[in-house]
């Protein structure tokens, strides 16, 4: 689990763009808003992500919603859905 | 395969300016990411700016304001534009392109993503 720090000045991220590519780890779980990840969840399958990156952002998802991901997210996961466990998958009620 | 060669290092006086070039060869696709790394002698190699396929960048806290990365498609070349240059600036710079078709690494900020890499120009910033 990445450590809580704060965002550095100028990093936060207005919105989900490939300029996150070079955000470390802890930079991700500082500098990107959750909420904001769940409403632009179409962008991240168009950047090329990481796998380790995709796990921090997968972390933030599953503290915005740790009673299963709404569909408006589902639908979008992409490569983040390789990064689901079958206990994630449960969670989910996809109609 | 991509060729990459860095030039426009040198000796300046602190608060002084320098541009270095890259030049990729071998290709026509831009690579995913194109960026500059820095080594300073006993410590890591660093990312100092990254340039996505797409034109944004990204600039390590320890240089923002003052550098300034960009390019010319025409000419397939990168630059790293350094002003206000300081004495903790002394390092040799790397230009790396990279496109990571495996995801691997931490994240694009970490060296171990690039596949292409020049071979280093030096700067050197005097106190």
């Known amino acids: 689990e990445v450590e809580k720090t704060a965002c550095p000045s100028g990093k936060k991220a207005p919105e989900i763009d490939e300029s996150l590519i070079f955000y470390k780890k802890w930079e991700l779980e500082a500098c990107v808003d959750a909420a904001l990840l769940a409403t632009q969840m179409d962008r991240v399958n168009a950047i090329p992500f990481t796998y380790e990156q995709l796990d921090v952002l997968k972390h933030k998802l599953d503290e915005l919603y740790p009673q299963g991901y709404p569909e408006s997210v589902i639908q979008h996961l992409g490569y983040l859905f390789l990064k689901m466990s079958p206990e994630d998958i449960r969670k989910w009620n996809v109609t | 395969e991509v060729q990459v060669v860095e030039s426009g290092g040198g000796l300046v006086q602190a608060g002084a300016s320098l541009r270095l070039s890259c030049a990729s060869s071998?290709?026509?696709?831009?690579?995913?990411?194109m960026a500059w790394f820095r080594q300073a002698p006993g410590k890591e190699r660093e990312l100092v700016a990254g340039?996505?396929?797409?034109?944004?960048?990204y600039y390590s806290d320890s240089v923002k304001g003052r550098f300034t990365i960009s390019r010319d498609n025409a000419k397939n070349t990168v630059y790293l534009q350094m002003d206000s240059l300081k004495f903790e600036d002394t390092a040799v710079y790397f230009c790396?392109?990279?496109?990571?078709?495996?995801?691997?690494?931490?994240?694009?900020?970490?060296?171990?993503?690039?596949?292409?890499w020049g071979q280093g120009t030096q700067v050197t910033v005097s106190s």
């Open positions: 340039l996505t396929w797409t034109g944004r960048t």
């Open positions: 071998g290709r026509t696709i831009s690579p995913i990411a």
């Open positions: 790396a392109a990279g496109d990571n078709p495996d995801r691997r690494g931490s994240s694009w900020s970490s060296s171990s993503v690039y596949e292409y």
